[in-house]
């Protein structure tokens, strides 16, 4: 098949680069003959510092190859990506990032966790790859629902909270208003729609403080809202159905003992919020004395019978509906309730199986007379909104 032309000279015998092979192997290469170079698995074709997918050289009329022999260079996955709120350890050896090298990602203990085992290998495609085939580094997700609080004490009939009791508690300050919210991720706050409705078009005017017990404490962690998402089924001024909103923060907050998200309820959590089961609500709202609390107060309150609650409010405020998206809590005898200024805060329950606290309700509305007998506090039933919450968080 050789094309011997008097005017052309044969090209030099190509020598395969280390960790590579040549095809086809011929006794002699003349004008227009070609060869390709293939690298062993774990090695890549490099022309200088530039990677190539394939390499073919052609013998020219002057007896030279049209391009120089490439190298087969060991795949180098390069330094692994940094892991926010975690770190990476080199398992194979210090800073070894070449083919088959192993690294181990891990999260800052106590406050962050990852779903995978965090072990990644430098594979032949040049990417750090997990055992599940994932090319992206893992994510250190904030731990949720850890609290030093044990069940025991609008907040009426409450007791002062201690550090670490309600690390998800967030203070929302407008120019003239105050409300609450609950951190549910490191950059999302759950609250009541009515508490932030006026701010929906001017999110940046909402001042968000967390990591505090004293309402006026100067030692707070400041967060700024990027966007407010009001539930599309909420109609301001026409009842409190779908009284739920999410605030996306501009930046992620660092999770620690005094700032931590509350968990969202698992599907099985409905069984933990039946009548007479106890939840806990905290806030800086009006106390029995009718003044805003200086210190974060909390109260442990039982879930009330839904039918009883519905009947009470039908009588008390005809036209005001207690819907299936709400749950009521309080004592028939009164004395324990949330009140004005607590709106948007979380009614939380302890999940006995996971030993984590989850948000079951959002402080929404109630009788003007906080803590009055037979007049329950009404809370947005969070479990009904898990798909809505997950949809907003995943899309924004």
């Amino acid at each position: 098949h050789h094309h011997h032309h008097h005017a052309s000279r044969p090209c030099p015998d190509p020598t395969a680069p280390p960790n590579g092979s040549i095809s086809p192997v011929q006794a002699i290469y003349v004008l227009k003959d070609r060869f390709s170079v293939f690298c062993k698995t774990g090695f890549e074709l490099l022309q200088g510092s530039v990677p190539l997918k394939s390499f073919t050289a052609v013998c020219q009329k002057d007896g030279s190859w049209d391009r120089p022999m490439p190298e087969c260079s060991i795949i180098d996955c390069g330094p692994p990506d940094d892991l926010p709120n975690g770190h990476v350890d080199y398992i194979t050896g210090p800073e070894v990032t070449t083919y088959k090298a192993v690294i181990q990602y891990s999260c800052e203990e106590t406050f962050y966790t990852m779903s995978s085992n965090g072990k990644y290998v430098c594979e032949a495609d040049g990417f750090w790859t997990s055992s599940k085939g994932e090319k992206l580094p893992p994510v250190c997700e904030p731990v949720c629902g850890l609290s030093t609080h044990t069940i025991g004490g609008r907040i009426v009939g409450g007791q002062p909270a201690k550090p670490g009791d309600f690390p998800w508690q967030v203070l929302l300050l407008g120019q003239t208003t105050a409300a609450a919210g609950a951190l549910i991720h490191d950059n999302w706050v759950l609250t009541a729609a009515h508490a932030v409705y006026e701010k929906r078009m001017a999110a940046s005017s909402l001042n968000i403080r967390m990591g505090i017990l004293k309402r006026l404490s100067p030692h707070y962690t400041q967060a700024w809202p990027e966007e407010i998402f009001i539930h599309e089924g909420y109609t301001h001024g026409a009842g409190f159905d779908n009284d739920i909103a999410l605030i996306k923060l501009k930046n992620k907050v660092t999770i620690n003992g005094s700032i931590m998200p509350v968990c969202l309820p698992r599907k099985e959590a409905a069984s933990l919020m039946r009548t007479d089961f106890t939840g806990t609500v905290a806030g800086w709202g009006l106390t029995q004395k009718g003044l805003l609390a200086r210190n974060l107060m909390f109260v442990d309150i039982p879930i009330a019978d839904h039918q009883k609650c519905t009947a009470v409010y039908e009588k008390l405020y005809p036209g005001v509906r207690v819907s299936a998206n709400m749950l009521c809590a309080g004592l028939e005898t009164g004395g324990k309730d949330s009140c004005r200024g607590d709106a948007g805060g979380a009614l939380v329950f302890l999940d006995n199986e996971t030993q984590r606290w989850f948000v079951g309700g959002i402080v929404s509305w109630g009788s003007i007379n906080c803590g009055a007998a037979d007049q329950y506090g009404v809370y947005t039933k969070v479990i009904n909104y898990i798909p809505w919450i997950e949809n907003i968080i995943s899309n924004f």
Partner: antibody, heavy 118, light 108 residues
Framework: DVQLQESGPGLVRPSQSLSLTCTVT?????????WNWIRQFPGNKLEWMGY???????SYNPSLKSRLSITRDTSKNQFFLQLNSVSSADTATYYC???????????WGQGTTLTVSS | QTVLTQSPAIMSASLGERVTMTCTAS???????LLWYQQKPGSSPKLWIY???KLASGVPVRFSGSGSGTSYSLTISSMEADDAATYYC?????????FGAGTKLELK
């Protein structure tokens, strides 16, 4: 024929992020080669910024590594540059290019001029 | 990184004159991985010479390139008006890829 075409905003404010797109026609960016971003400053100095290879791996100029990200969309045969925290020193003409790897295969876009100014 | 120094920065030549410009690397570069580009005002750089001495398609044979190690040059055997431009050398022997600052060739 292989063609590369840059597109971008023209003007960016200091401290903001710059995003540029290179649309490639006549050749698939996954077929081979490294797809580069190069910039030319007002005094005509050329600087290689980085590349994304046919496999999606990236290599960056160490002087820009902390601010630079090059990504791609293979379905649109496009690759992108994102440069964070820009300053007036980033004012330049930005080119996307395939640089010849010892063969006569070298293509550049026509360049897009970027001014960083408040 | 490998610094490429081009000299002279600016030069002028008469029609028919022989022109040589140099590109000096701060560390050795494989001759396979040294390129020259030509750029005219308002245009993108054009590949002119690759692998130190191979002319890109469409480049007149009056151009030639040579060199090895740290010393490379581009030569025009007989200057023509169309050759007035800025010429840049580029190495891709090792990362980061680096360009020389350019030699601006003007017509006398």
């Amino acid at each position: 024929d292989v063609q590369l075409q840059e597109s971008g905003p023209g003007l960016v404010r200091p401290s903001q992020s710059l995003s540029l797109t290179c649309t490639v026609t006549g050749y698939s960016i996954t077929s081979d080669y490294a797809w580069n971003w190069i910039r030319q400053f007002p005094g005509n100095k050329l600087e290689w910024m980085g590349y994304i290879s046919y496999s999606g791996r990236t290599s960056y100029n160490p002087s820009l590594k902390s601010r630079l990200s090059i990504t791609r969309d293979t379905s649109k045969n496009q690759f992108f540059l994102q440069l964070n925290s820009v300053s007036s020193a980033d004012t330049a003409t930005y080119y996307c290019a395939i640089i010849s790897t010892a063969v006569d295969f070298d293509y550049w876009g026509q360049g897009t001029t970027l001014t960083v100014s408040s | 990184q490998t610094v490429l120094t081009q000299s002279p920065a600016i030069m002028s030549a008469s029609l028919g004159e022989r022109v040589t410009m140099t590109c000096t690397a701060s560390s050795s570069v494989s001759s396979s991985y040294l390129l020259w580009y030509q750029q005219k005002p308002g245009s993108s750089p054009k590949l002119w010479i690759y692998s130190t001495s191979k002319l890109a398609s469409g480049v007149p044979v009056r151009f030639s390139g040579s060199g090895s190690g740290t010393s490379y040059s581009l030569t025009i055997s007989s200057m023509e008006a169309d050759d007035a431009a800025t010429y840049y050398c580029l190495q891709y022997n090792r990362s980061p890829l680096t360009f020389g600052a350019g030699t601006k060739l003007e017509l006398k």
